[in-house]
Interface confidence: low
């Protein structure tokens, strides 16, 4: 998929692209191809639609093989009645500095959240809201009974005075992680994303994982028992190898997939886990990608509409969101 080979185009004539999909030159300047759309997998040879402000997000500089088409501008955020652009930072109050990242808001507290233990010169620390000050501050109360000082010092430990523990880099971080978005494909290999600041420097970052709700070639409706309307998690007879842009998983997996219903309900993953999967490509390169593995599925009427560009936003509820 790199540009080192001479141009070899799949067809001499330009391909016919679906309505609304741009016809562009591939990343090697060789062949005219249909541009990849938001959330789709992209490579150097399969570029994203530039007319929609999309770029191929490879995740890390080391991985230049397969990325996900991402909006340059990202989805805006609505927070406290105001609309913020992706990447825009704002103060939601004097206590929090927030950032909008592709439709999700993450906030970092501006006020110190340190813990103060009793010490000889401040045996009874207490946080109070002082007039004209935004952040609460520590004050040292005088004990009513001087003899109470002794037991209070039992909690004072010498090691607490020897500087900050490097593992406490995030002491001032209000850790927030959105739920994983719905898989971008209802069948076959897709992408699921989330936003988190659960990292060393409390920076908002977008994470992605591969996902497969069900294989496209499986005719699951055939397996629905008589009198039943759904098959929630059909048994997949044999272990499978996952395929990703011409690369194949090194191991086989006995994965669970979600089934289908005949009464208008849709079955989607309910409980999932994320595991790394190694893919081997025809040029011998091995790449590791995180992938969703389904534990349980649920069948329900809350089905996202086909081709709904806001589909993934329905799943963007923040854990511990302050709104």
């Amino acid at each position: 998929q790199d540009c080192s080979a001479q141009c070899q185009c799949a067809a001499e004539a330009a391909p016919h692209c679906p309505a609304g999909v741009s016809l562009v030159l591939d990343g090697c300047g060789c062949c005219r191809v249909c541009a990849k759309q938001l959330g789709e997998l992209c490579t150097e040879r399969d570029p994203c639609d530039p007319h929609k402000g999309l770029f191929c997000d490879f995740g890390s500089p080391a991985n230049r093989k397969i990325g996900v088409c991402t909006a340059k501008d990202g989805a805006p955020c609505v927070f406290g009645g105001s609309v913020y652009r992706s990447g825009e930072s704002f103060q939601s109050s004097c206590k929090y500095q927030c950032t909008c990242l592709d439709g999700a808001v993450g906030c970092v507290p501006l006020c110190s959240m340190d813990v103060r233990l009793p010490s000889p010169d401040c045996p009874f620390p207490r946080r109070v809201k002082l007039p004209g000050k935004c952040c609460e501050e520590w004050v040292c109360d005088e004990p009513k009974d001087r003899t109470a000082v002794g037991p209070a010092l039992a909690a004072y430990r010498l090691e607490d005075t020897f500087g900050p523990d490097p593992t406490m880099m995030r002491a001032n971080c209000l850790v927030q992680t959105t739920e994983w978005s719905a898989c971008s494909k209802t069948c076959g290999m897709g992408i699921s994303t989330r936003v988190t600041n659960d990292n060393t420097f409390c920076r908002l970052e977008k994470q992605s994982r591969l996902c497969m709700v069900r294989p496209c070639e499986a005719d699951l409706e055939e397996n629905i028992k008589k009198g039943k309307k759904c098959i929630r998690t059909p048994k997949i007879a044999k272990p499978v190898k996952f395929e990703l842009s011409g690369c194949t998983s090194v191991k086989t997996y006995r994965a669970k997939f979600c089934g289908v219903c005949t009464d208008g309900r849709c079955c989607t993953p309910h409980r999932t886990t994320t595991l790394p999967v190694e893919f081997k490509c025809p040029d011998g390169e091995i790449m590791k990608k995180n992938m969703m593995f389904i534990k349980t599925c649920a069948c329900h009427y809350n089905c996202p509409g086909d081709n709904d560009i806001f589909e993934s936003l329905y799943y963007r509820k923040m854990y511990g969101d302050m709104a």
Epitope: S4, A5, Q8, A10, A11, E217, K241, E243, G246, C247, T248, V250, K280, P282, D283, G284, E285
Partner: antibody
Framework: EVTLKESGPVLVKPTETLTLTCTVS????????VHWIRQPPGKGLEWLGV???????DYNAAFMSRLTISKDTSKSQVVFTMTNMDPVDTATYYC????????WGQGTTVTVSS | ETVVTQEPSFSVSPGGTVTLTCRSS?????????ANWVQQTPGQAFRGLIG???NRAPGVPDRFSGSILGNKAALTITGAQADDESDYYC?????????FGGGTKLTVLG
């Protein structure tokens, strides 16, 4: 012009080791991988292995224990080594460029006989 | 063991169209099998025609095209010519290795 040329012994004794060299021109071994394929007399093609442009190798599982492919990019040479040769290994051995097996060498016929 | 099967022989009239196929013993052929088609001329020389399912090698005329038809890889030759009379081999990639088919001997009648 892209060319590949195999060279090596035409006769090998059973149990001996076969070493063939594929010398390429018109392209760089850091840009394209090279495959090794053989064709026994009157039969079809059998894929043996490949050395990719980044130096990784893949082998036909049936020959994994006997086969080694290496390269010297600066000399534009790929070296193919097969140990413990047997009369059934008598064939014409080819190297071919990766990328649709688009260019092939003319082949070198190797006979395994005592 | 994975087996790749091709029609042993095929014939076509000059100017006619012929489609040679390549079947995998372990399921449908997909683009991830990177189907390759190689021509061996009567003089024993090899040249690659198609790589990566449908990409023509340099210098290959557009009479040759590669595709996936149903669950098989296919090589279609339109406007067949006398010098297309050759053996045609397909090769499929399976994660760590290629497997060649047994080859198809194409005869151009006349």
């Amino acid at each position: 012009e892209v060319t590949l040329k195999e060279s090596g012994p035409v006769l090998v004794k059973p149990t001996e080791t076969l070493t063939l060299t594929c010398t390429v021109s018109g392209f760089s071994l850091s840009t394209f991988g090279v495959h090794w394929i053989r064709q026994p007399p009157g039969k079809g093609l059998e894929w043996l292995g490949v050395i990719w442009r980044r130096g990784g190798t893949d082998y036909n599982a049936a020959f994994m224990s006997r086969l080694t492919i290496s390269k010297d990019t600066s000399k534009s040479q790929v070296v193919f080594t097969m140990t413990n040769m047997d009369p059934v290994d008598t064939a014409t051995y080819y190297c071919a460029r990766d990328g649709g097996f688009d260019y092939w060498g003319q082949g070198t016929t190797v006979t395994v006989s005592s | 063991e994975t087996v790749v099967t091709q029609e042993p022989s095929f014939s076509v009239s000059p100017g006619g169209t012929v489609t040679l196929t390549c079947r995998s013993s372990i399921g449908a052929v997909t683009t991830s099998n990177y189907a390759n088609w190689v021509q061996q001329t009567p003089g024993q020389a090899f040249r690659g025609l198609i790589g990566g399912t449908s990409n023509r090698a340099p210098g290959v005329p557009d009479r040759f095209s590669g595709s996936i038809l149903g669950n098989k890889a296919a090589l279609t030759i339109t406007g067949a010519q006398a010098d297309d009379e050759s053996d045609y081999y397909c090769a499929l990639w399976y994660s760590t290795h290629y497997v060649f088919g047994g080859g198809t001997k194409l005869t151009v009648l006349g």
